[in-house]
Interface confidence: low
């Protein structure tokens, strides 16, 4: 490697001395505290002498040295001033150091009221001090000087030193950001290194590093390592990269120049469409996954899925992967057909081959309907039970149920519905249902209630009185009854053509109507029964009511 720079030290350690004084220069090598062999000394870039590691000087100028084990040191400017007052700075001084300044008079005993200045402005709290400390100096062009009063017999004469430019050495070099590649391939790793060099005179100084893309901090922020490994680079990682180095005490911070990094893209190739379930045989209601993949391709890939006969794409996904999935939830019959997918990460999409998808339709909930000669089915009617699933791949087997009894089954080989016929009896009332099954799961219909009604038979009217002869004041009961017929039955009672009243019977035994007899109640009586399926009239019964006499006339 490159030999380390020699280090030039001063004794006494001030870079300015009075003319006539001597300053010792010591050449030190980092690899060995004392230089081995000859030391080359330079004054204002001219070889001064070849000697040991220490020389005495009395002349101003720029001094350098080098030894066998080290390269040429940085120049140190030593000033020998003829002035009465000088400002001295400790040497060496590095960026961020606190530097001691000393204002010295040739006759220092007779020098007093020393004041220190930076760029013409008095430094705070610097009055009448032998030495001051300037905190955290930087490599700027600040000029320092001091003033003092010199005793001259009985006079105090103000004197001013020459301006002093403190020789502040770089603690570490300006960083340079190095990337393992300035044009990485998308998805590939990259190493960024923030390179700098610490002054060999300050090996104990600890540095920390931070790397940036545009305004975003990379990694974990400040780190003792100058290196950052990025596992995978993407196009959005393209940009302006730079780094900062600072001492852990935050005293000195330096920033590198920006480096443009452009992430390169690998075009997609070998686009393949795969369908799950495998084979593209689906049952309606299942979820279909269309998996579009590429053999190669980097970065953000735009995947799209297409169906034959449809203008717009089924979906698009832009993501950083070689594979994307489109989920078609609960596929429908209309989802059957031919599909392809396309992938694009540059300019034009690459298409997959076509894949056919078939969709078998499970039966929908079937609907059970009754077909009968009239709205209110009656005993003897022929009832057709019709069960139909509006959707479902054939063949469909239909089963018919009355309550929980299976009445029979019927197949529909090419879809549609199926029928089952019943000749109704009074026992056929109740709940009917059907189910449909095409091998993809049976579906049950809602229950449908059927009421089979029985028309009323011709009623019989009976008159019941206390004695054989109806007499004024007797209580007469008229009883009307149909022996057959579905309830409720409405019974009507008549005297001649006048309606006496009606009574509804919800169970067997007929209905009765009571009359308190007067002479006007003589005449013909009849009744009628009706349950909504047609009224039936009884035969006429004649009643003769006698007056006050007790001998009774019989009922005819």
């Amino acid at each position: 490697g490159v030999a380390p720079k020699a280090v030039l030290l001063l004794n006494p350690p001030w870079s300015t001395a009075f003319k006539g004084e001597k300053v010792a220069l010591i050449c030190s090598s980092i690899s060995h505290s004392l230089a081995q062999g000859d030391t080359y000394w330079y004054h204002d870039e001219k070889l001064l002498k070849i000697k040991h590691d220490k020389i005495q000087i009395t002349e101003p100028g720029n001094y350098q040295c080098k030894t066998r084990g080290s390269s040429l040191s940085d120049a140190v400017h030593v000033e020998f001033s003829p002035d009465w007052l000088i400002l001295q700075a400790l040497h060496p001084v590095f960026e961020g150091d606190n530097v001691i300044l000393r204002c010295q008079g040739k006759d220092n005993k007779n020098t007093h009221q020393k004041v220190y200045y930076k760029d013409g402005k008095q430094l705070p709290n610097s009055y009448n001090l032998e030495k001051i400390t300037v905190n955290s100096v930087s490599r700027d062009n600040s000029k320092y000087h001091c003033t003092a009063y010199r005793k001259f017999y009985i006079l105090d004469i103000e004197v001013t030193s020459k301006p002093l430019n403190i020789q502040v050495q770089e603690l570490f070099l300006h960083p340079v950001l190095r990337a393992s590649s300035s044009t990485p391939i998308e998805g590939s790793p990259m190493t960024l290194t923030c390179e700098t060099q610490l002054s060999p005179q300050r090996p104990d100084v600890q540095l920390q590093f931070s790397l940036f893309r545009d305004s975003q901090t990379l990694g974990l922020g400040w780190s003792r390592s100058p290196r950052l490994q990025i596992p995978a680079m993407w196009t959005e990682d393209s940009g302006s990269y730079w780094c900062e180095v600072e001492t852990v005490t935050h005293s000195i911070k330096k920033r590198s120049l920006r480096s443009q990094i452009r992430v390169q893209r690998v075009p997609v190739s070998n686009v393949n469409l795969e369908i799950r379930p495998t084979g593209g045989q689906l049952i309606e209601g299942e979820n279909m996954v269309l998996i579009c993949s590429v053999a190669q391709g980097s970065g953000t890939v735009t995947f799209s899925w297409h169906k034959e006969g449809r203008v717009r794409s089924l979906g698009r996904k832009t993501q950083r992967s070689l594979l994307a999935e489109l989920h078609v939830l609960t596929v429908k019959e209309s989802d059957a057909g031919r599909y392809y997918c396309a992938a694009d990460n540059v300019h034009s999409p690459i298409l997959s081959t076509w894949i056919r998808v078939t969709v078998r339709i499970p039966v929908s909930h079937p609907v059970l309907t009754f077909r009968a000669p009239r709205a209110h089915t009656v005993v003897g009617d022929l009832l057709e039970l019709h069960c139909e699933s509006l959707r479902g791949s054939p063949p469909i087997l239909y089963r018919f149920y009355h309550e929980d009894v299976t009445l029979g089954n019927s197949s529909a080989p090419s879809g549609g519905g199926a029928s089952f016929n019943l000749s109704l009896t009074a026992e056929h009332s109740g709940n009917y249902s059907c189910d449909a099954d095409n091998g993809l799961g049976a579906q049950h219909s809602h229950g449908v209630s059927l009421r089979v009604t029985v028309p009323v038979s011709r009623p019989v009217l009976t008159l019941r009185a206390p004695g054989a002869q109806a007499v004024v004041g007797d209580l007469l009961e008229l009883h009307c009854e149909s022996l057959r017929g579905s309830f409720p039955i409405l019974y009507w009672f008549y005297h001649e053509d006048d309606t006496l009243g009606n009574i509804s019977a919800h169970s067997g035994g007929g209905a009765s109507f009571n009359l308190s007899l007067t002479t006007e109640h003589s005449g013909n009586y009849s009744c009628e029964a009706d349950n909504g399926l047609g009224a039936q009239h009884s035969k006429v019964v004649t009643l003769n009511v006698t007056g006050t006499s007790r001998n009774r006339t019989g009922l005819t």
């Epitope: 596992p231 995978a232 950083r320 594979l323 994307a324 999935e325």
Partner: antibody, heavy 116, light 108 residues
Framework: EVQLQQSGPELVKPGASMKISCEAS????????MNWVKQSRGKNLEWIGL????????TYNQKFKGKATLTVDQSSSTAYMELLSLTSEDSAVYFC?????????WGQGTLVTVSA | DIVMTQSQRFMSTSLGDRVSVTCKAS??????VAWYQQKPGQSPKALIY???YRYSGVPDRFTGSGSGTDFTLTISNVQSEDLAEYFC??????????FGGGTRLEIK
């Protein structure tokens, strides 16, 4: 629909180790970073670390180095977090969360109770 | 690490009110802040990212604002379903993400 399904609650003894799983579905598992977050009794959320399912590379919060180990199984689209040498301090709800910088998708959480 | 401070652990509000939840970063995080809502027994749900962008499906009564070190989540016209814990999260220094301590929104 993106879903992260985590394993059920665990009661473990101090000093033991255990592994939580997070099964991903509804997206390409290897294309997104998976993070793990701890929520202790005090409700504070702490980021534990992340794993890149594509290559298994991990980054941990310094605090959880040596405490958590993150792995993935690409074939089952599942991320795992193993918690080592458990103490009562590790009793918490642990979440997996998808996202590079912020977390739009979270698992339902796994309650870990460390008790003798 | 960057510390995210949610100074108000609890906040009381009335239904229909407007409420602001604040979060302070210990250093400049630009606009790299997300907000989450968490209801008891549930996982956090993303509301806001990049300080002010509403995540898809989030009602527009949720608004995020702020940059640098001070961030605010505002809920206008508070609904009963908004009563939850709200967390902020910074993501400036990849990937050392940190969360705020949370602010619980309660009914007065």
């Amino acid at each position: 629909e993106v879903q992260l399904q985590q394993s059920g609650p665990e009661l473990v003894k101090p000093g033991a180790s255990m592994k939580i799983s997070c099964e991903a579905s509804g997206y390409s598992f290897t294309a997104y970073i998976m993070n793990w977050v701890k929520q202790s009794r005090g409700k504070n959320l702490e980021w534990i670390g992340l794993i890149n399912p594509y290559n298994g590379e991990t980054t941990y919060n310094q605090k959880f180095k040596g405490k958590a180990t993150l792995t993935v199984d690409q074939s089952s689209s599942t991320a795992y977090m193993e918690l080592l040498s458990l103490t009562s301090e590790d009793s918490a709800v642990y979440f997996c969360a998808r996202g590079l910088y912020w977390f739009p998708y979270w698992g339902q959480g796994t309650l870990v109770t460390v008790s003798a | 690490d960057i510390v995210m401070t949610q100074s108000q652990r609890f906040m009381s509000t009335s239904l229909g009110d407007r409420v602001s939840v604040t979060c302070k970063a210990s250093q400049n995080v630009i606009t790299n802040v997300a907000w989450y809502q968490q209801k008891p027994g549930q996982s956090p749900k993303a509301l806001i990212y990049s300080a002010s962008y509403r995540y898809s499906g989030v009602p527009d009564r949720f608004t995020g604002s702020g940059s640098g070190t001070d961030f605010t989540l505002t809920i206008s016209n508070v609904q009963s379903e908004d009563l939850a814990e709200y967390f902020c999260q910074q993501y400036t220094n990849y990937p050392m993400w940190t969360f705020g301590g949370g602010t619980r929104l309660e009914i007065k």
